[in-house]
């Protein structure tokens, strides 16, 4: 007789968690030469223990501090990139400029990149029929709590110029409900961080606005400014022509330059 | 209990190639890596290359580039080294190990292949 | 690739002594180096990794140390059950590398 279950609005666990979590991990830490010394069992082991047997609305950022000790890893000054709205855009460039990092090119970014998990108080089970959904269930669900962990701690850890990509084809290029926005501007620390710098992003072709105006952007400045982290902001205008010119900096279309400074 | 079965002894002619079997049992068969390790008689180990089944991903070492071929069938979480062209330096017991990062914490019986003509 | 060159090759020693086994990275592996051990038609079995955690269920009288270049394996004082051969390898850059062995046998 299959024994009662929490039914949640949101997507069940992804097939195959567990064994995703630790081919994702082996596989990261066999490129990453600083990440050698992982034992991806006691991550595996780490990240089940975060939220299996407990309730999946009950969620905390302790819950997940085994996991993020196991995963400490640090960018380089003035390497790290944060996004909002603009994963897939971001992702590429840093698969271009290796140098370059997002949370999805750390260890436990990369792991959870894309996954849904939670699992029910007192079984050992992991819930592949559904999950807490962040508006309609609950937000201290082990999804979100996981990102808003793995995200305060990239923050914190940044140091020099720090660059975020924003969807600028967005109503609100910066929104202050989005995980860059509630968590990560928050997190920058003035005395490792000397600026701020936003890159805009464009979608329409024919879009010469200087969207560094806009009243979220302004808005942004205001919050970073006031946390004595200097601001600046780049339109991208044609984020393929940018693609194109970051993989091969020496094209002649790309010497005029292919966006516009605001300091601020 | 994580243990890994397999198969039995070859006795394979030179030119000729031996695929050997490894059963796994425990959880996640797939995310973890089965690595091939060789051992000719009296000699050292050797490490010939893995598999991370759930990507398909293999890894081989130079030395063993284009003769050798790792697979695995998710279905019966099993994993297959097939080595090709053999010849009688290729005497050896081969071991497939799970590993869950570069060290190597389970181990298969071994298989002793004797290329002989 | 990274060459493993473990010293000495035997190591005649009583029960109850302390053995010393040495393992030379002929470039650095950081501490990504693990220990086995492996009996006459058995299995190699892990011992040690990150040059000096013990792998679950590995009696205290085995210790690692060293990193870089230069590790030890030390059994403090050995049993009977510890005469065998002991291996060491690197995983700090592909393809992964073990020594020739270090053979442990009774004075």
């Known amino acids: 007789v299959p024994r009662w279950r929490q039914q949640w609005s949101g997507s069940g666990t992804t097939s195959r968690f567990p064994e995703t979590v630790l081919a994702r991990c082996v596989k990261y830490t066999e490129v990453h030469p600083e990440m050698r010394h992982v034992d991806c069992q006691s991550v595996w082991d780490a990240f089940k223990g975060a939220f299996i047997s407990k309730y999946p609305c009950n969620i905390t950022e302790e819950d997940y501090q085994p996991l993020v000790k196991l995963g400490t890893q640090t960018v380089p000054c003035n390497k790290t990139l944060l996004w909002s709205r603009i994963k897939d855009l971001a992702h590429q460039f840093t698969q271009v400029q290796r140098d370059m990092f997002t949370l999805e090119d750390m260890l436990l970014g990369y792991l959870a990149d894309d996954l849904t998990w939670c699992g029910e108080f007192n079984t050992f089970e992991i819930n592949y029929q559904s999950c807490p959904d962040w508006r309609k269930d609950c937000s201290n669900n082990p999804v979100s709590v996981f990102w808003k962990t793995v995200s305060r701690r990239f923050a914190e850890t940044a140091c020099g110029v720090v660059h975020v990509m924003l969807n600028g084809s967005r109503s609100k290029i910066f929104d202050k409900n989005s995980t860059f926005g509630s968590v990560e501007v928050h997190n920058l620390q003035p005395e490792k961080v000397q600026a701020l710098e936003a890159w805009v992003i464009h979608g329409g072709r024919e879009d010469s606005r200087d969207l560094c105006q806009d009243p979220t952007i302004k808005e942004l400045e205001s919050i970073i400014s006031k946390r004595n982290i200097r601001f600046f902001c780049k339109n991208i205008y044609r984020p393929d022509k940018f693609l194109q010119c970051v993989k091969n900096p020496e094209d002649s279309s790309c010497l005029s330059g292919i966006h516009h400074h605001h300091h601020h | 209990q994580v243990q890994l079965v397999q198969s039995g002894a070859e006795v394979k002619k030179p030119g000729s190639s031996v695929k050997v079997s490894c059963k796994a049992s425990?959880?996640?068969?797939?995310?973890?890596?089965i690595n091939w390790v060789r051992q000719a008689p009296g000699q050292g180990l050797e490490w010939m290359g893995r598999?991370?089944?759930?990507?398909?991903?293999?890894y081989y070492a130079q030395k063993f580039q284009g003769r050798v071929t790792i697979t695995a069938d998710e279905s019966t979480s099993t994993a297959y080294m097939e080595l090709s062209s053999l010849r009688s330096e290729d005497t050896a017991v081969y071991y497939c190990?799970?590993?869950?990062?570069?060290?190597?914490?389970?181990w298969g019986q071994g298989t002793l292949v004797t290329v002989s003509s | 690739e990274i060459v493993m060159t473990q010293s000495p090759a035997t190591l005649s020693v009583s029960p109850g002594e302390r053995a010393t086994l040495s393992c030379r990275a002929s470039?650095?592996?950081?501490?990504?180096l693990a220990w086995y051990q492996q009996k006459p038609g058995q299995a190699p079995r892990l011992l040690i990794y990150?040059?000096?955690t013990r792998a679950t269920g590995i009696p205290a009288r085995f210790s690692g140390s060293g990193s870089g270049t230069e590790f030890t394996l030390t059994i403090s004082s050995l049993q009977s059950e510890d005469f065998a051969v002991y291996y060491c390898?690197?995983?700090?850059?592909?393809?992964?590398?073990f020594g020739q062995g270090t053979k442990v046998e009774i004075k």
């Open positions: 190990a799970r590993s869950a990062a570069g060290w190597f914490a389970y």
């Open positions: 425990g959880d996640f068969f797939s995310g973890y890596a």
């Open positions: 990150g040059a000096s």
């Open positions: 390898q690197q995983y700090n850059n592909w393809p992964w590398t």
């Open positions: 470039q650095s592996v950081s501490s990504n």
């Open positions: 598999i991370i089944p759930l990507l398909g991903d293999t």
